[in-house]
C-alpha cells in the first residue's frame, strides 16, 4: 500500500527584499513523488528550483524538499504543489508571522 | 500496462478550431500529467502544454492564446482544443505521459500520434 | 525559448559501429536533458532522462553524457531496430524544447 507524505512549507530570509520557501514532504511511501513549485498557478521552471534527493527516513517511508526563492511580499502568489500516488495537494507560503504549515494527506 | 491513444478529425479547415482527444489506460489521469506534442511534417517536435493531476495547466507562451487543455477524469480522457487554425498548424499530435520526480521531468509513455492536416 | 541544437541532421553507419550524436544548448541547462527515439513509423520512446540514465528495458549500449551546453548521445553497438531519429530535449525552462533531430541510417 501508499503512505501519504506529511507536507511542510516553510520561510527563510534570503538576502534583501527575497525569502527562500522551502516545501518538505515526509514520510511517504511509495518513494515517487512530484513536488514542485507553482506562481500564480504556472509552474516554475526547474531553473528556477532547488530539490533535495528523495531519501530513506528510516522508517521504511521517504523524505525529499524543494526550494525556490522570491521577493518578500509576493508570497500569497507562490504555492507548492504536491503529487502522490494518485492524490495531490497545493500548499501555500505562510505569512512573516506564522512560520509552519504543514498538513498530512489520505 | 499504461497507454495513450489520440483521436482527432483528420482535416480541418482554415480558422477553424481542432479538437482532440487522448484516452488513456494503466494509470490514473488524478495522479499524473499528461502532455500534448507536436510534430510538422519532416520537422522536430513542439511541446504544446500540459494538464497535472489536479487539472492545472502549463502552456507554451508561444501558443497560449489559441490553446485550451483540459480532461475527464472519470473518462481517463485528456482533451486539447486550438483554435484559429491555419496551414502550418499541419503536424502529428502526440500526447505523452509526464513524470515529474524532482530534477527529473520527463515523457515516459507516448500515444501513437494523431495527424492533422488544416485544408481547405 | 531555449534552442536545441543537433548539427547533424542525418548519418549513416554501419552495423556493430559506435554512433554518437551531439546536442547543444543555447544556455546552461543543468544536466536537465532527455533523448528521445522516433522510429520510422513515428512511434516515439523514452531513451534517456536526465543526461545519463536510462529506464528499464532500455538495451545498455545506450548511453549519455554532457553538461553544461553540450551533451551526446551514444548507440555503443548499431542495431538494426536502432534505424530511428533522435531528439535531444531540455526542460530546465519553460517551455520544454527539442533539438531538430538526427536520423541514423544503415550504411
Known amino acids: 500500500g501508499s503512505v501519504p507524505p506529511m507536507v511542510n512549507v516553510t520561510r527563510s530570509e534570503a538576502s534583501e527584499g527575497n525569502i527562500t520557501v522551502t516545501c518538505r514532504a515526509s514520510s511517504f511511501y511509495p518513494r515517487n513523488i512530484t513536488l514542485t513549485w507553482r506562481q500564480d498557478g504556472v509552474s516554475l521552471s526547474h531553473d528556477t528550483q532547488q530539490w533535495g534527493d528523495v531519501l530513506p527516513d528510516g522508517n521504511g517511508t521517504y523524505q525529499t524538499w524543494v526550494a525556490t526563492r522570491i521577493c518578500q511580499g509576493e508570497e500569497q502568489r507562490f504555492t507548492c504543489y504536491m503529487e502522490h500516488s494518485g492524490n495531490h495537494s497545493t500548499h501555500p507560503v505562510p505569512s512573516g508571522n506564522s512560520h509552519h504549515h504543514h498538513h498530512h494527506h489520505h | 500496462q499504461v497507454q495513450l491513444k489520440e483521436s482527432g478529425p483528420g482535416l480541418v479547415a482554415p480558422s477553424q478550431s481542432l479538437s482532440i482527444t487522448c484516452t488513456v489506460s494503466g494509470f490514473s489521469l488524478t495522479g499524473s500529467g499528461v502532455n500534448w506534442v507536436r510534430q510538422p511534417p519532416g520537422q522536430g517536435l513542439e511541446w504544446l502544454g500540459m494538464?497535472?493531476?489536479?487539472?492545472?495547466?502549463d502552456y507554451n507562451s508561444a501558443l497560449k492564446s489559441r490553446l485550451s487543455i483540459s480532461k475527464d477524469n472519470s473518462k481517463s480522457q485528456v482533451f486539447l482544443k486550438m483554435n484559429s487554425l491555419q496551414t502550418d498548424d499541419t503536424a502529428r499530435y502526440y500526447c505523452a505521459r509526464g513524470a515529474h520526480y524532482g530534477k527529473r521531468w520527463y515523457f515516459d509513455v507516448w500515444g501513437a500520434g494523431t495527424t492533422v492536416t488544416v485544408s481547405s | 525559448d531555449i534552442q536545441m541544437t543537433q548539427t547533424t541532421f542525418s548519418l549513416s553507419a554501419s552495423l556493430g559501429d559506435r554512433v554518437t550524436i551531439s546536442c547543444s544548448a543555447s544556455q546552461g541547462i543543468n544536466n536537465y536533458l532527455n533523448w528521445y527515439q522516433q522510429r520510422p513509423d513515428g512511434t516515439v520512446k523514452l531513451l534517456i532522462y536526465?543526461?545519463?540514465t536510462l529506464p528499464s528495458g532500455v538495451p545498455s549500449r545506450f548511453s549519455g553524457s554532457g553538461s553544461g551546453t553540450d551533451y551526446s548521445l551514444t548507440i555503443s553497438n548499431l542495431e538494426p531496430e536502432d534505424i530511428a531519429s533522435y531528439y535531444c530535449q531540455q526542460y530546465s525552462k519553460l517551455p520544454p524544447t527539442f533539438g531538430g533531430g538526427t536520423k541514423v541510417e544503415i550504411k
Open positions: 494538464i497535472w493531476g489536479d487539472g492545472n495547466t
Open positions: 536526465y543526461t545519463s
